[in-house]
Interface confidence: low
């Protein structure tokens, strides 16, 4: 029994001690508990805020909570303070004091903080009566980085992002003209061909039997060879010449189902598919 | 190292009113904060009135209205103006400069004492 209860006592101690870290470094008639001030060191980036957290471990009647800064002459500069309830800014009125709900805590914050506010501050209690002491709270540093300087730990997944979406703007903007190149290109395909077809083919008196007139009678498309240049011209291909049936070739387009005539022309009643020409329907479309 | 010499000490009546000065030698005062203490027979010295280097000041419920402290930097001397002086004000009043140093500790300084009532 008495072995169990035994280490309890010990536990108990231990934890007093873990909690009032202050009993041990303070003469033991202080009248008051150690402050904290946290974190012990912060690191924002220029123009953010910084804000650094004043805590008393207990809430005396009346006191004044100060907020310094301590200048490389080892001197104090009060930035601001907290007293009867009420806020009492400094000069600068970047540096804030807040009192938060609980009462023991108090936020002090520099609003945009600025390169040169790189330094070491504190928070101070002065005690009013009847415990008429002051205590200070353990430095804390601040650093203060360049904007310019603090992105580059943050760079290198912006600009890949920023290299992806130029990479796919460049393959959008690349197959839109390549989209677009095409259809100017089948755009003048079609117009050469088929301005021929509205007119009908080019009849040259050759001993061909005569278009079929009437409404079962399909028309004829006939391909000048000669007529698709696909060399890149900056004026509009001129009008075939007229018809030489001694100087005209033509292509031989072969569609399944209905052989067509032999290096003439090729009937659009037998459009049912399209097929390669064969090397040995003669000259093909494109030219070699 | 700071000196500070007080002066203005004297028996007042009740109701009667009273000006200390606490004079600091050197010329680094301003970056101290200025406190007024008092002392009374048997009892623990408490805090009258402070104020900081930037001009806030801080009194005790018992002076509040009654006291006024002020600072004048470019002589390097703080003031206690006593008004509507009590039987209870009777106490040995002490100048005190303030400040935190490099070690975060408290680095104060104190007058020699000046008797009121």
């Known amino acids: 029994m008495g072995s169990r209860r035994g280490p309890w006592p010990l536990v108990w101690a231990v934890l007093q001690l873990g909690w009032w870290p202050g009993w041990l470094l303070d003469s033991p008639d202080r009248p008051w508990s150690p402050l904290t001030f946290s974190p012990a060191q912060l690191t924002v980036q220029e123009g953010e805020n910084a804000t650094f957290t004043c805590s008393l471990a207990d809430i005396p009647d009346s006191f004044v909570l100060n907020w310094y800064r301590l200048s490389p002459r080892n001197q104090t500069d009060k930035l601001a303070a907290f007293q009867e309830d009420r806020i009492e800014p400094g000069r600068d009125r970047r540096f804030r004091v807040t009192r938060l709900p609980n009462g023991r805590d108090f936020h002090m914050s520099i609003v945009a903080a600025r390169l040169n506010d790189s330094g070491i501050y504190l928070c101070g209690a002065i005690y009013l009566p009847p415990n008429t002491q002051i205590n200070e709270s353990p430095r804390a540093e601040l650093s203060v980085t360049e904007r310019t300087l603090e992105p580059p730990t943050q760079s290198p997944s912006p600009p890949p992002r920023l290299s992806g979406q130029l990479q796919g703007l460049v393959i959008g903007v690349t197959s839109v003209l390549v989209g677009v190149l095409l259809l100017l290109l089948l755009t003048w395909v079609l117009a050469a061909v088929f301005p021929r077809a509205t007119r009908g083919a080019c009849v040259c008196g050759s001993e061909d039997e005569p278009l079929k007139e009437g409404p079962d009678a399909a028309p004829v498309f006939t391909l000048d060879y000669g007529e698709l240049d696909f060399q890149w011209r900056e004026k509009t291909p001129e009008p075939p010449a007229p018809c030489a049936p001694e100087q005209t070739e033509y292509a031989t387009i072969v569609f399944p189902g209905r052989p067509a005539s032999p290096g003439r022309r090729a009937s659009a009643s037998s459009l049912q598919g399209a097929q390669p020409p064969s090397p040995e329907d003669g000259p093909g479309l494109w030219p070699p | 190292q700071v000196q500070l010499v007080q002066s203005g000490g004297e028996v007042k009546k009740p109701g009667g009113s009273l000006r200390l000065s606490c004079a600091a030698s050197?010329?680094?005062?301003?970056?101290?904060?200025m406190g007024w203490y008092r002392q009374a027979p048997g009892k623990q010295r408490e805090l009258v009135a402070f104020?900081?280097?930037?001009?806030?000041?801080n009194y005790a419920d018992s002076v509040k209205g009654r006291f006024t402290i002020s600072r004048d930097n470019a002589k390097n001397t703080v003031y206690l103006q006593m008004n509507s002086l009590k039987p209870e004000d009777t106490a040995v009043y002490y100048c005190?400069?303030?400040?935190?140093?490099?070690?975060?500790?408290?680095?104060?300084?104190w007058g020699q004492g000046t008797q009121v009532g």
């Open positions: 104020i900081t280097r930037g001009g806030s000041t």
């Open positions: 005190n400069a303030d400040r935190v140093g490099a070690t975060m500790r408290r680095v104060s300084y």
């Open positions: 050197g010329s680094i005062f301003s970056i101290y904060d």
